[in-house]
């Protein structure tokens, strides 16, 4: 069967939003009504991988484009970045490991660790208005806890 | 036994609030994705509010959104519906339900408390 | 969103008959389909999920089958204790939403 997709928003554990920001990078920033709109809706995919109660292997799409959340290495570093796919091919079952993340799910905190960089989390700054990015730490100055909307 | 009791519903007027209860037991509460679905008089099924296991992930149909919100408390194996602004619209049985959004279908059910909306 | 119909909204047949409930999706869930039986008075029972898997304690009796839009649910020889009403439920995507349901009756 082919991969189901589901769309949903993403708030930091500040209650950040996250919106575009140029082509290829979101950032996080506070939003209140009317503004929630410019919020990046995903289209979250649920994808082949090791999986449990707490971890389930997604793909995170943005909706109605054809980028993909990805990690790579850059100068060395693990790198979060937003990198366009051919949308004959996207979303698959099998997604190349680069895009995958276990979404995990423990005591109301929800995290997004890349598998292809174990112990690397999607994250955003305390500060507002800086880019979403791949961070190495967590419990630290930088977020790494979501909630997690889901929209229809 | 697995069981879910919902609690709470009663008789309310338009524009007030409720709020409902479900008491799970039989099976690890906290290891599992919970809905609220309701039931209009002989009408069919309606899944109005979802929380994950873990209270990070939520979904409300556009029928409720910003009216109702769902919560759980995993320590005391409780899931909650508040209902503000309530409308006539609201008015059926509502049922607790185990699942959600990841495995989909809900494969236990409360026996449902009763709203009714009404001046 | 997926709008779920069936068919027929009711039907009476007799004990030992073979009954068949049809649902149509309006675009293709993928198997991603349930079925649940509600009898009086009573809440949802699940008996299928992923278009053709019993679920636990559910009789034999009981069957689904279909692909992409459509889906049928069967029952191969019916007893007095199938009165119910019968619903399907898409999950391919949210909103997940039933059909407005079959009233089975025993003539």
């Known amino acids: 069967a082919p991969v189901r997709s589901l769309h949903c928003t993403l708030r930091d554990a500040q209650l950040k939003s996250l919106v575009m920001s140029g082509p290829y990078e979101l950032k996080a920033l506070h939003l209140q009504g009317q503004d929630l709109e410019q919020q990046v809706v995903f289209s979250m995919s649920f994808v082949q991988g090791e999986e449990s109660n707490d971890k389930i292997p997604v793909a995170l799409g943005l909706k109605a484009k054809n980028l993909y959340l990805s990690c790579v290495l850059k100068d060395d570093k693990p790198t979060l970045q937003l990198e366009s796919v051919d949308p004959k091919n996207y979303p698959k079952k099998k997604m190349e490991k680069r895009f995958v993340f276990n979404k995990i799910e423990i005591n109301n905190k929800l995290e997004f660790e890349s598998a292809q960089f174990p112990n690397w989390y999607i994250s955003t700054s305390q500060a507002e208005s800086m880019p979403v990015f791949l961070g190495g730490t967590r419990g630290g100055q930088d977020i790494t806890d979501f909630t997690m909307q889901f929209v229809s | 036994e697995v069981q879910l009791v919902e609690s709470g519903g009663g008789v309310v007027q338009p524009g007030r609030s409720l709020r409902l209860s479900c008491s799970a037991s039989?099976?690890?509460?906290?290891?599992?994705?919970m809905s609220w679905v309701r039931q209009a008089p002989g009408k069919g099924l309606e899944w109005v509010a979802y929380?994950?296991?873990?209270?990070?992930?939520?979904y409300y149909p556009d029928s409720v959104k910003g009216r109702f919100t769902i919560s759980r408390d995993n320590s005391k194996n409780t899931l909650f519906l508040q209902m503000d602004s309530l409308r006539a619209e609201d008015t059926a049985v509502y049922y607790c339900?185990?699942?959600?959004?990841?495995?989909?279908?809900?494969?236990?059910w409360g026996q449902g408390t009763p709203v009714t909306v009404s001046s | 969103d997926i709008q779920m119909t069936q068919s027929p909204s009711s039907l009476s047949a007799s004990v030992g008959d073979r009954v068949t409930i049809t649902c149509r999706a309006s675009?293709?869930?993928?198997?991603?389909l349930t079925w649940y039986q509600q009898t009086p008075g009573k809440a949802p029972k699940l008996l299928i999920y992923?278009?053709?898997t019993l679920a636990d304690g559910v009789p034999s009796r009981f069957s689904g089958s279909g692909s992409g839009t459509d889906y049928t649910f069967t029952i191969s020889s019916l007893q007095p204790e199938d009165i119910a009403t019968y619903y399907c439920q898409h999950f391919w995507s949210i909103p997940y939403t039933f059909g407005q349901g079959t009233k089975l009756q025993i003539t």
């Open positions: 339900a185990r699942g959600g959004v990841y495995k989909g279908y809900f494969d236990v």
């Open positions: 039989g099976f690890i509460f906290s290891r599992y994705d």
């Open positions: 992923n278009a053709k």
């Open positions: 675009g293709n869930i993928h198997n991603y």
């Open positions: 929380i994950s296991h873990g209270g990070a992930g939520t």
